[in-house]
Amino acid sequence: FERTRSLQDPCSNCPAGTFCDNNRNQICSPCPPNSFSSAGGQRTCDICRQCKGVFRTRKECSSTSNAECDCTPGFHCLGAGCSMCEQDCKQGQELTKKGCKDCCFGTFNDQKRGICRPWTNCSLDGKSVLVNGTKERDVVCGPSPADLSPGASSVTPPAPAREPGHSPQ
């Protein structure tokens, strides 16, 4: 079948990195600079992706594969093949439509992306708070109050000022 196909279509013999040049009796020509073909039998080469501005080159374009981009520091990739770059925030913040905002009381974010999440409620597991939560860190739950030896104390969490939730926008 391969032989039959190549007799019928001389372009099928053109390997990746080349294209079947109709202007030159269908001979296989190398892809021009800044273009590529990732499969054989192509009649054209595709233009290489250019990583500009907030996008930076993660992998250079070759004659057989497209360039790959990622985002410059301060941004993170979104979408297939890093089609978009979204702003990072600091730990203890979340990105809102108006920019980076601090996590409100009772919530935390330990990453540069994502949303502020409520602190763990230790009492739901019958445990006590060993280390208080912050904007950047979740609470650390310790043994249940009953497990504590006499005289030992645990850090009691401050009463929440309001329901944990998203920062006001």
Partner: nanobody, 119 residues
């Protein structure tokens, strides 16, 4: 699955107008706040506008306030962005998004439509 397909982009002269559309499927469109975001060449994502589920509350970035109007047709599961008095700095790929910021939720955005404002 969730699909958002933008259309209506193109090349327009400064001062001109365009109307972008976003056809949504795979989720109950009428329950969600919807947003338009954009990415200008070499820049990061910028939130442009959003509209609540019922269509009676809208919000805009300062850079487009008074020029752009967001609307929706829940019966057609379609989001719109009417862009008037366009400026060269509005040149960008415009994305329709089910929620914003995009990286904080599930990956619910479209493939984008290119808007180029040039004389």
């Amino acid at each position: 699955q969730v699909q958002l397909v933008e259309s209506g982009g193109g090349l327009v002269h400064p001062g001109g107008s365009l109307r972008l559309s976003c056809a949504a499927s795979g989720f109950i469109f009428s329950l969600y706040t919807m947003s338009w975001v954009r990415q200008a060449p070499g820049k990061g994502l910028e939130w442009v506008s959003d509209i609540n589920s019922g269509g009676d509350s809208t919000d805009y970035a300062d850079s487009v306030k008074g020029r752009f109007t967001i609307s929706r047709d829940n019966a057609k599961s379609t989001l719109y962005l009417q862009m008037n008095s366009l400026k060269p700095e509005d040149t960008a790929v415009y994305y329709c998004a089910k929620d914003y910021p995009l990286g904080q939720r599930e990956d619910y955005w479209g493939q984008g439509t290119q808007v180029t404002v040039s004389s």
